[in-house]
Amino acid sequence: IWELKKDVYVVELDWYPDAPGEMVVLTCDTPEEDGITWTLDQSSEVLGSGKTLTIQVKEFGDAGQYTCHKGGEVLSHSLLLLHKKEDGIWSTDILKDQKEPKNKTFLRCEAKNYSGRFTCWWLTTISTDLTFSVKSSRGSSDPQGVTCGAATLSAERVRGDNKEYEYSVECQEDSACPAAEESLPIEVMVDAVHKLKYENYTSSFFIRDIIKPDPPKNLQLKPLKNSRQVEVSWEYPDTWSTPHSYFSLTFCVQVQGKSKREKKDRVFTDKTSATVICRKNASISVRAQDRYYSSSWSEWASVPCS
Amino acid sequence: RNLPVATPDPGMFPCLHHSQNLLRAVSNMLQKARQTLEFYPCTSEEIDHEDITKDKTSTVEACLPLELTKNESCLNSRETSFITNGSCLASRKTSFMMALCLSSIYEDLKMYQVEFKTMNAKLLMDPKRQIFLDQNMLAVIDELMQALNFNSETVPQKSSLEEPDFYKTKIKLCILLHAFRIRAVTIDRVMSYLNAS
């Protein structure tokens, strides 16, 4: 058993049929010695008496808020949560496996630049009695500070018969140098509590590996005289690290017909303009990627040819 | 501690081309190592990230763009002084800091070159003959060093009398390639910045 936060405790349980329960001794936080009784949750029934209560925790029915009282007055609370371990593996019932980039990916994180700011998100089908708490650091043995905000519900989607909820959190490394070469990964730890079930999820990454620039901005077409060609121009996204001559991007320009089956013409360039042939009803899209370190491409910025 | 925004004459910055070749070569070599050594811990998640130049050179700090010198987190106290007479420099217009930056890059390349050559000698003794260093990568390191053209003491190639542990050598190769790729990215960024300045 360990303390998650004040008056909230996590009991770690081996979850197999013939596992014995965990013996837990609850102590009432009071100088009083006599006349102390214990109750659980909303029930007023006395579960035991005395300054300590010894219980066997084996099921979710044994978890909950234990309260000690004296003469109708509440003295203290202890909320017990369960953390299940099945076949040596901690349960992952609360969050959905996103399976990207690999199986057992519950947390996904992205950064728009090298400033040390990043966003992580996760999915669940649970809609109520759900809380998240996020902590992060650079490295684990001698951790350096990363500050995370509160996790918020960022999207709701309908997937077949189920509703899916996306939560996200923003974190910022306390003293980040955009030009630094990372040798210690960022660690992100999410505590998830659903009713009386506790689970924790972790992700470890280098900012350089989760970079995904915003799409190029101010995408414009300039027709060239007496030609089907157009000059496409764009700018670095505002959120990208500066100076741009140091944090350079490379771009992919794509001409896509109305039909998805039509052949796509693609051009790669380090410049912020390109000359392409604009077909009728086609659209021109441009996306960006770090020029020197191949992390993710940005989403496409698009304009119609017409 | 930073790179001033100087304006070298056109064509006076041949190092950019060499640094691009370097990044391409080390990236290809790392990809080859990851594929060939697929049953070894050779991915970014699996390896320990070691920097053989740590406390010996200060490339990131010495080559910091002017715009980032206002960022306190980028100003590290490590100082290293180097001999400064490189041919990538735009002669009279080059500041001391720019020379310090480029000589720091040169020292990095020299250190990695020695490590890679020593390692290759060991890998050539492996009866499995599983992996060797790409000669192109070693050549590209050499070309960039020549372009930087700093006079520096030659570091003797390390020789080892004991029987090499090939498993450990291959893991060390992965560690070295990952670190060198990260440094090659920094070098490329620096050269791009200097070229645009």
Epitope: D41, L47, D62 | -
Partner: antibody, heavy 119, light 107 residues
Amino acid sequence: EVQLVQSGAEVKKPGESLKISCQSSGYSFTTYWIGWVRQMPGQGLEWIGIMSPVDSDIRYNPMFRGQVTMSVDKSSSTAYLQWSSLKASDTAMYYCARRRPGQGYFDFWGQGTMVTVSS
Amino acid sequence: EIVLTQSPATLSASPGERATISCRASQSVSSWLAWYQQKPGQAPRSLIYAASNRQSGIPARFSGSGSGTDFTLTISSLEPEDFAVYYCQQYNIYPYTFGQGTRLEIK
């Protein structure tokens, strides 16, 4: 006052289905799991299983798994035990009981439902 | 599963006497053992839990002791209403199991 009131005695033929009930009152129904115990004529007590009234989480005794089904209706604070195809060997007294949280034993018991299966 | 063996199967005693019933487990159940009393035509009633804790409303003449594999239920001075069948039950490991019962009869 804590009370578990069970449905009346049943006489059935082999192969028939049956569902007996246990209605709880006098306490917070969702705080306490409900269990079932069998007592064959002139025999001792046998633990069938327990069930959470919150989310219908169930722990069956392997000996009874597939033979009986436990269920619960939170809205009426009622637990059920059912058979899809009775056998003569199912003849017994069935007790529902309330599981004490933080312990696991049964602190309050229903009066029992006698089930007789005979052709 | 854990087998609980009660002894004796039948105990004959007189009112006012001390009665002791033993329950032995085939493997340790820590202190997670309960005792029940059942009278003819009635449902069992909880007497003792966690080996030695008396259920609320149970007279002080009933006491329990033991831990691990050996447990004892003691009735210090028998009253006429105490003649019944007594069962021990372990609730440490699933499936929870009961002893075969001890019949306490009037001598």
